[in-house]
């Protein structure tokens, strides 16, 4: 029997600093976790001790903290390749700067390998990208080989930007050949390493013939067998093991987000590469952990633009930015309309003809909104200005929802209207209308939709039983302000971007900003 | 680090007045919603009042009310209490406290006010 | 709103399942949040937005309920466990439960 350990990260989320325990910035340092120096650590300790270990990254790596807003995945490839990781699958998040933002960066800088098979290039990009990322890579392991096959969402253009050059294949369909590939190359130990989540990891084992492990990122979903660490509740067992239809036992694995965990996996392999037990759990990387100093001291060095970053300008603003309480918790503000606006800029993708863009809504709780931006500071906005105005921390998410939810959450947005409170919706791609002398929860008179399937978009009465696709703050996707309708009944739901950064980078693109107060919002009373 | 230390309590006699300070750090105070809590000796807890993060909403509980007043100074990163005409069932541990946002709140040690002649 | 919680105390052992339950006088939406506090320490927050479990707090610990009838329940009790229960709505102007003590049967 031949043992190997697979160490595993996901969906890190730009977290190369350590975090406080919810993977927002750090207040504690006695009680903070996660971050590349103490990940090094506990690698460099595993390494020493077993003989046969790979250090594997499942996607999305890129996206989430100022590192990369500022670095532009610069520092995924510097601090993976100091970590000295060993393969990475390509997430949606990867392609958020466009494929350029991916090639340049990353794919040019790694040492490592970065993979996915159901990607594939045409047009002029084809050679471009050519052998800069692969479907798989055979690696040798003491005195072993072992194949590692890359996937990623298919919904990717749904989420990033990777542009019309890449065709994103079913899953299953594409790794099937290239798993076949790797046997008759006489690799038999076979681990499919993608960023597609959960549901489709367990798919993959099933369904993939050849395929011994699957380390999937994605739905940051948490998997432990025993008491857990932490505040995280398990989806499963670790390693979670689904049975393939030719009969095989295939544990799949994932290990939450933002660096918090080191997946750990032990995997014995017979002479013939059948698994022939796996086990294992994540390892949470808290403060009796020590931070490497060489690593930390590097990422001091790499901070030092962050601080500057804060206070340059980013564009302008030439209009009062109104971000005050007793606008955007009584009625349209222009703050909530910029923010909405920076929210749809952000999910431009055109990945149909017969859609001018796949989402068109916007909903935003006005207690979200922190602070107003003053024009007369010579019109200069900052990103310590958008750090007070969503002081927070959240990710702009992308849900679906039926029309009968959102009609619920405008009813809630005015259940209490006139107290101040933070679940007044400040929107986008929505005109709705309100009359405050009908009583609650009958107070939405008209309630109208920007269209997503035409050509030119105009405003359509939501229909009840329909299913739509809107962006707001995780906080509401969440239930937060009361907003229980969103988190019982959405359909799906998807991660976004840092919600400062989507705002920063609509801003810097405008380069000159004013918003307007134009209607989104009106009050009525009477018959309509 | 997030630091919420409350100062200002002591002994004071009925009808008389104190001032409890709540300083602020480590985070943007400016952006929190912020409370007083009072907890009576051997008693449950009970909330006393809150400001709005820019100073414009103010509440309080009917048990206080017309007698104490909430204020903050943003630029000091510091909340108030003005306590007058004290009674003896005033007699508590304030604490202040973040209201719970995104990422929860926080909460200070507290600080003893004693009402007694 | 006022809050109603119960019991007022309750004994339990180490590994027991606990349930402590609130009840608002009106309807609060998920406006709610339970908090455990220690002899002589502030209070700490546990479930917000009625279900929402507070960064660092252990998974044994989970919160339902909407509208008016709220449940804080303990899988598996720890010693550590052993402490003062509060409901809290914020809703309205905020009030507290009278709280639940949780004694060592």
């Known amino acids: 029997a031949w043992e190997l350990t697979i160490l595993h990260t996901n969906d890190v989320h730009s977290r190369l600093e350590q975090t406080s325990e919810d993977s927002s910035k750090c207040v504690n340092a006695s009680r903070c976790m996660g971050g590349v120096a103490r990940l090094f650590t506990k690698v460099q300790q595993i390494r020493r001790a077993e003989p046969n270990v790979l250090l594997l990254d499942a996607g999305d790596q890129y996206q989430g903290t100022i590192w990369f807003t500022v670095y532009k995945g610069a520092e995924v490839a510097h601090f993976m390749n100091a970590l000295r990781y060993d393969a990475m699958a390509l997430g949606n998040h990867e392609f958020d700067n466009g494929v350029e933002g991916l090639i340049e960066p990353l794919l040019k800088e790694a040492k490592f390998p970065i993979l996915s098979a159901n990607i594939k290039a045409k047009g002029p990009l084809a050679s471009q990208i050519s052998g800069l990322y692969l479907p798989y890579k055979v690696l040798p392991v003491g005195d072993e080989v072992v194949g590692i096959v890359g996937y990623t969402s298919k919904e990717t253009p749904f989420l990033s930007n990777p542009g019309t050059n890449l065709v994103f294949e079913d899953e299953i369909t594409a790794l099937q050949p290239e798993v076949d590939k790797l046997k008759t190359l006489n690799v038999n130990k076979i681990i499919a390493l993608g960023h597609s989540g959960f549901e489709m990891d367990k798919l993959i084992a099933q369904k993939v013939r050849g395929v011994d492990v699957v380390v999937g990122g994605h739905s940051n979903t948490f998997l432990y067998t025993g008491n857990p660490p932490s505040k995280e509740v398990p989806a499963g067992k670790y390693p979670f093991i689904v049975t393939s239809d030719d009969g095989r036992k295939v544990p799949v694995v994932q290990a939450y987000a933002f660096g918090k965990y080191l997946g750990y996996l032990k995997i014995e392999f017979d002479e013939r590469g059948n698994v022939i037990s796996s086990h294992g759990n994540p390892i949470l990387l808290n403060s009796s952990i020590p931070e490497d100093p060489s690593i930390k001291a590097d990422i001091n060095k790499w901070r030092i633009k962050l601080d500057n970053y804060s206070t340059q300008e980013l564009g302008k603003t030439i209009v009062y930015l109104d971000g005050s309480s007793q606008s955007c918790r009584f009625r349209e503000c222009n703050m909530g309309n910029l923010i909405c606006d920076a929210m749809i800029n952000n999910n431009l993708r055109h990945t149909d003809e017969m859609f001018w863009n796949h989402v068109s809504m916007c909903i935003l709780n006005g207690g979200g909104i922190r602070s107003p931006i003053d024009e007369r500071n010579n019109g200069t906005i900052t990103w310590e200005n958008l750090a007070a105005v969503l002081p927070f921390g959240g990710t702009f998410d992308l849900v679906q929802l039926k029309g009968s939810t959102l009609k619920k959450a405008f009813e809630h947005s005015v259940h209490r209207y006139g107290q101040s409170t933070g679940e007044f919706l400040q929107v986008g791609g929505i005109h709705v209308v309100y009359d405050l002398s009908r009583k609650p929860g009958d107070r939405v008179v008209k309630l109208d939709v920007l269209c997503t399937k035409c050509r030119v978009p105009s405003y359509d009465p939501l229909k009840m039983d329909e299913v739509y696709k809107v962006i707001l703050p995780n906080f509401l996707a969440n239930g937060g302000d009361g907003f229980q309708m969103i988190k019982d009944e959405l359909l799906r739901h998807d991660s976004g971007d840092q919600d400062i950064n989507v705002v920063s980078t609509y801003i810097s693109k405008m380069k000159v900003i004013y918003p307007a107060v134009e209607g989104r919002i009106k009050f009525s009373t009477g018959s309509h | 680090e997030v630091q919420l230390v409350e100062s200002g309590g002591g002994l004071v006699q009925p009808g008389g007045s104190l001032r409890l300070s709540c300083a602020a750090s480590?985070?943007?105070?400016?952006?929190?919603?912020m409370h007083w809590v009072r907890q009576a000796p051997g008693k449950g807890l009970e909330w006393v009042a809150v400001?709005?993060?820019?100073?414009?909403?103010?509440y309080y509980a009917d048990s206080v009310k017309g007698r104490f007043t909430i204020s903050r100074d943003n630029s000091k990163n510091t909340l108030y209490l003005q306590m007058n005409s004290l009674r003896a069932e005033d007699t508590a541990v304030y604490y202040c406290?973040?209201?719970?946002?995104?990422?929860?709140?926080?909460w200070g040690q507290g600080t003893l006010v004693t009402v007694s002649s | 709103i006022q809050m109603t919680q119960s019991p007022s105390s309750l004994s339990a052992s180490v590994g027991d399942r606990v349930t402590i339950t609130c009840r608002a006088s009106?309807?609060?939406?998920?406006?709610l949040a339970w908090y455990q506090q220690k002899p002589g320490k502030a209070p700490k927050l546990l479930i917000y937005?009625?279900?929402t479990l507070q960064s660092g707090v252990p998974s044994r610990f989970s919160g339902s309920g909407s509208g008016t009838d709220f449940t804080l329940t303990i899988s598996s009790l720890q010693p550590e466990d052993f402490a003062t229960y509060y409901c809290?709505?914020?809703?309205?102007?905020?009030?507290f439960g009278q709280g639940t003590r949780l004694e060592i049967k």
């Open positions: 809290q709505q914020s809703y309205s102007t905020p009030h």
């Open positions: 480590g985070f943007t105070f400016s952006s929190y919603d």
């Open positions: 400001m709005s993060y820019e100073g414009s909403n103010k």
């Open positions: 406290a973040t209201e719970i946002a995104a990422k929860g709140d926080y």
């Open positions: 937005a009625a279900s």
């Open positions: 009106q309807g609060i939406s998920n406006y």
